[in-house]
């Protein structure tokens, strides 16, 4: 006799209206007399409609949270599992069923705003900037949201960039408990005489890092020959085991680069002789402490203005 | 007695491969889900791996999802992790778990005694 | 992804003592948790399953309560041989499985 387990009954995506964050939840299947004492673990199977691969959970639970790309709609599945204890062994599973959520397509795709891009400025305050959208009326203004993880519900902006009285973008600073969780940010618009499509964006905050440059750069010569520059690290929140420094040095004409996670760097000069040495220097969060990230701008040169004769200190 | 004895283990450069592999008596071993687990040295439990009891789904840790594999030979009573691409933060003890009920993954109610995976140049 | 929380870190603790350590889940994992006690060298051993089942074998003194996201892991009354390391797990969803980052209980 073929052991046979139902699919969840009223699987559904809900969106709680918290940019992107979606909850898919279902209930029990009806479950016959003799599997009544079973664990049930439900597989639930789910995607942008546009990606290849499928995330794939398990769970005892009735409910499951993830972010989403609301730019684009949401599919899933999700069947019933019996334990091989259940079950004399054999692998039993229901059929699966689908649910899907679709975006709203309200507004062309040529009124959403283009060439959104988000910088955390020195791991303190985030900036967002955006265009306005290829084809708006003059009336057209954009409204930016924004949740993550911690937030009861999603914020409005309460400091826009503004160009021509228009919202070109949005500053945000005191993001307690922010970073290393997804940061949903919605933007959208009004205008009285045509619908405007919402753009959606999710990424993580260490990930947009842009530290201010190394300051108090030092240069020093040793034995006419031994080259050592040190800087600090700059004032702010990073801590110094999460930078990553390149450096250009300048000898006479010839430059080169290096590369270190210290705050500090030794070298031979190339030729004894020369007259001018100076370096810069820039740095960005590392691998350690995040995925990505954006270069400081460059220090300040610093030049050794030492006598280059063979005795000089 | 339900036993399980894990093998394989040993020094590796970084970038080699080990295949660990864990012998199971005492239970039949078709029927439970298994697992790797492992322990950095000094550092607390990681899972890394899990296989349902047929062997027909498998489940990752996302440190080690495209370079490790988990499979079993119920008919040898085997579970085996084959480890590619290894890194330096891969070294630990790898202990093979038993799950006490469930499909893919539960509670762990037998270990091995652990194999040392080293992974140095 | 779930994760649990241990604490205390370190527990000082007598021989006697009623100790109580502490897990949380980032959320709601029902009653899908696992209690274990690990010794130096040697592989976690099993204390409590669905968050308040006693493993066969496994002494009374040892108890497991809570469900949601708050759980508890009690000892009556300590004995020598429990000065070890406790973790936690979570398997109500995964992948991945996760554990507590351990305490340990050492003699005061």
């Known amino acids: 006799l073929e052991i046979k387990v139902n699919p969840p009954q009223d699987f559904e995506i809900l969106d709680p209206g918290l940019l992107g964050y979606l909850y898919l939840q279902w209930k029990p299947p009806v479950v016959i007399e003799k599997f009544k004492g079973c664990t049930l673990e439900y597989e639930l199977k789910y995607r942008n409609v546009d990606s290849d691969s499928w995330k794939t959970i398990i769970t005892r639970n009735l409910i499951y949270k993830d972010g989403f790309d609301l730019n684009k709609g949401i599919e899933g599945k999700i069947r019933t599992h019996l334990s091989e204890h259940c079950t004399n062994g054999s692998e039993v599973q229901s059929p699966w069923i689908e649910a899907s959520y679709g975006i709203s397509d309200e507004g062309s795709l040529e009124t959403k705003i283009q060439d959104m891009k988000c910088i955390y400025y020195n791991w303190q305050y985030l900036v967002c900037s955006w265009k306005p959208g290829k084809t708006v009326y003059s009336d057209t203004n954009y409204t930016m949201f924004f949740w993550y993880e911690g937030l009861d519900h999603a914020l409005q902006c309460a400091d826009y960039l503004q160009h021509d009285e228009k919202n070109v973008g949005c500053k945000l600073s005191n993001l307690d408990s922010s970073d290393y969780k997804d940061f949903f940010i919605c933007v959208n618009g009004s205008s009285k005489l045509e619908p405007i499509r919402s753009s959606y964006t999710v990424f993580q905050l260490q990930n947009i890092v842009k530290p201010l440059p190394p300051e108090f750069l030092h240069i020093s010569v040793e034995n006419s020959i031994d080259i050592r520059m040190k800087w600090s690290t700059p004032g702010g929140p990073i801590p110094p085991r999460c930078y990553t420094y390149e450096i250009v040095i300048r000898e006479d004409d010839i430059s080169w680069e290096s590369a270190t996670d210290k705050n500090d760097m030794k070298l031979k000069r190339r030729a004894n002789e020369s007259e001018d040495l100076c370096f810069f220097v820039r740095c960005k969060v590392n691998i350690y402490c995040a995925d990505d990230g954006i270069w400081s701008e460059w220090s300040e040169e610093e030049c050794w203005e030492g006598y280059t004769g063979p005795d000089s200190k | 007695e339900v036993q399980l004895l894990e093998s394989g283990g040993g020094l590796v450069q970084p970038g080699g491969s080990l295949r660990l592999s864990c012998a199971a008596s005492?239970?039949?071993?078709?029927?439970?889900?298994m697992s790797w687990v492992r322990q950095a040295p000094g550092k607390g439990l990681e899972w890394v791996s899990a296989?349902?009891?047929?062997?027909?789904?498998?489940y990752y840790a996302d440190s080690v999802k495209g370079r490790f594999t988990i499979s079993r030979d119920n008919s040898k009573n085997t579970l085996y992790l084959q480890m590619n691409s290894l890194r330096a933060e891969d070294t630990a003890v790898y202990y093979c778990?038993?799950?006490?009920?469930?499909w893919g993954a539960g509670a762990f109610d037998y270990w091995g005694q652990g194999t040392l995976v080293t992974v140095s140049s | 992804d779930i994760q649990m929380t241990q604490s205390p870190s370190t527990l000082s603790a007598s021989v006697g003592d009623r100790v109580t350590i502490t897990c949380r889940a980032s959320?709601?994992?029902?009653?899908?948790l696992a209690w274990y006690q690990q010794k130096p060298g040697k592989a976690p051993k099993l204390l409590i399953y669905?968050?308040?089942s006693l493993e066969s074998g496994v002494p009374s003194r040892f108890s497991g309560s809570g469900s949601g996201t708050e759980f508890t892991l009690t000892i009556s009354s300590l004995q020598p041989d429990d000065f070890a390391t406790y973790y936690c797990?979570?398997?109500?969803?995964?992948?991945?499985?996760?554990f507590g980052q351990g305490t340990k209980v050492e003699i005061k």
């Open positions: 797990q979570q398997y109500d969803t995964y992948p991945p499985i996760t």
């Open positions: 669905d968050a308040s």
């Open positions: 778990a038993k799950v006490r009920y469930g």
């Open positions: 296989i349902t009891g047929s062997g027909g789904s498998t």
């Open positions: 005492g239970f039949t071993f078709k029927l439970p889900a």
């Open positions: 959320q709601s994992i029902s009653s899908w």
